[in-house]
Interface confidence: low
């Protein structure tokens, strides 16, 4: 469940973050799942662990596999899995689907293309950008920090964009490339104060003790691409990551775009093995963007087993 797909190209740097998060003071141990062999932390190794990060400097096809990260705190452990695939470099220009990051949309007024995963790396500007393998040239294209800006976007600007940058680790340089599709939208979007579609305000959700329960926080933020919007859960006024109950975790759900153009986000709260004390907690679904924050509160109640004798 707490698994993340990561991919890269041979002879390039790849840095993977543990899909389970914890406080900075928690230690994180990494293992190669197939052999249960511990990943070393010494930086002289080609593959080494550095806290929440697993670094392949550079990556090799043989590194492909599932890596386990265990976030250790004084009171609990959290386990995550990184499913890493390293591919051979393509000889032709085509970037296969399995190497593509999420598609982004732009319009005449908003044409930023962010370089995927770059925040994990120690890089310095400028980035190099390519479209369909051709280096971008001309005054319409501006590489700005970790994104590309295209002026006066036209439908012909749609295509696959690749960013290339250098990761520096202890004085050694490693190349990284990442590709994503860019589509052009005609209509102008807008954002509005978040609207929570689920759960209803002060909803009571029936759950069975000992069973698993899921709560979905679903909210809409406007029309078109929403760059500053988030949904999340809180327990008794505390972030899930800070609450410290490993049975209760939140997981990003679907980004939805409806036929009426509304852009919505889901966040699923998963409660494993529901306990009596879970019924005493207050569950807040929070939706927020630049307009502000909206909160819907949910409480759990015990589902009474059906009495067959009545």
């Amino acid at each position: 469940k707490f698994s993340k797909q990561s991919w890269g190209l041979e002879n390039e740097a790849l840095i993977v973050r543990c899909p389970r998060q914890g406080k900075p003071s928690y230690t994180v141990d990494w293992y190669y799942s197939q052999t249960n062999k511990s990943i070393p932390t010494q930086e002289r190794n080609r593959v080494f662990a550095s806290g929440q990060l697993l670094k392949f400097l550079p990556a090799a096809v043989a590194d492909s596999g599932i890596y386990t990260c265990i976030v250790r705190s004084p009171t609990f452990n959290r386990t995550g899995y990184a499913n890493v695939t390293i591919y051979k470099k393509q000889s032709d220009c085509n970037v296969p689907d399995y190497l593509m990051y999420s598609t982004v949309s732009g319009s005449e007024k908003n044409s930023k293309i962010y370089c995927p995963t770059i925040d994990l790396y120690n890089w310095t500007a400028p980035l190099e950008w390519f479209k369909n393998c051709q280096a971008l040239q001309g005054s319409r294209y501006r590489a700005h920090k970790s994104f590309l800006v295209i002026d006066n976007v036209m439908t012909e600007d749609a295509g696959d964009y690749t960013c290339k940058f250098i990761h520096n680790e202890n004085g050694a340089n490693y190349s990284v490339t990442a590709t994503r599709s860019f589509t052009v939208k005609d209509e102008q979007g807008f954002s509005l104060f978040p609207v929570i579609g689920a759960p209803a305000q002060n909803e009571i959700k029936e759950v069975e003790i000992g069973k698993n329960a899921n709560l979905t926080c679903s909210a809409c933020f406007g029309k078109g691409t929403q760059f500053l919007a988030a949904v999340l859960w809180q327990l008794n006024g505390t972030k899930i990551t800070d609450f410290g109950e490993p049975r209760i975790q939140q997981e990003e759900g679907q980004n939805q775009s409806f036929s009426n153009g509304l852009a919505c986000l889901d966040m699923v709260l998963r409660i494993a093995d529901v306990k009596e004390e879970d019924l005493l907690l207050q569950y807040d679904c929070l939706a927020l963007n630049l307009h502000g924050l909206r909160r819907h509160t949910v409480r759990l109640s015990r589902k009474n087993p059906i009495d067959h004798h009545s």
Epitope: P24, P116, D119, L120, H144, F227, L228, L286, L288, L293
Partner: nanobody, 122 residues
Framework: ESGGGSVQAGGSLRVSCAAS????????MGWFRQAPGKEREGVAS???????TYADSLKGRFTISKDNAKNTLYLQMNNLKPEDTAKYYC?????????????????????WGEGTQVTVSS
């Protein structure tokens, strides 16, 4: 954090926050403030690309910036008012773990400074 202190209404102050490592370079960073008896509120935030976001109520009086070479975050406060009196906190976070979301909300932040007091007298 440093740079707090007392100032007359209409005056200016600049508070700064020295950060380290990944906490500084890879994250959404922001300034928050908490007045006595009130909830902590977001003031401004800046992401790893340098894009800034401000609380609506500030009406352009505050400016957030950062110096990557010095790993330092700044908040320039101009035309200060008595209602700006509060303890100011610097914070950093992963923006909900979602890509490129950086808003000055408590929920976006994972790391917090100790705070510096700003007092504005009329």
């Amino acid at each position: 954090e440093s740079g707090g202190g007392s100032v007359q209404a209409g005056g200016s102050l600049r508070v700064s926050c020295a950060a380290s490592g990944y906490t500084y370079s890879s994250y959404c960073m922001g300034w928050f403030r908490q007045a006595p008896g009130k909830e902590r509120e977001g003031v401004a935030s800046i992401d790893s690309r340098g894009s800034t976001t401000y609380a609506d109520s500030l009406k352009g009086r505050f400016t957030i910036s950062k110096d990557n070479a010095k790993n330092t975050l700044y908040l320039q406060m101009n035309n200060l008012k008595p209602e700006d009196t509060a303890k100011y906190y610097c914070a950093a976070g992963d923006g909900y773990g979602l890509e490129h979301i950086c808003i000055p909300h408590y929920y976006a932040m994972n790391y917090w400074g100790e705070g510096t007091q700003v007092t504005v007298s009329s």
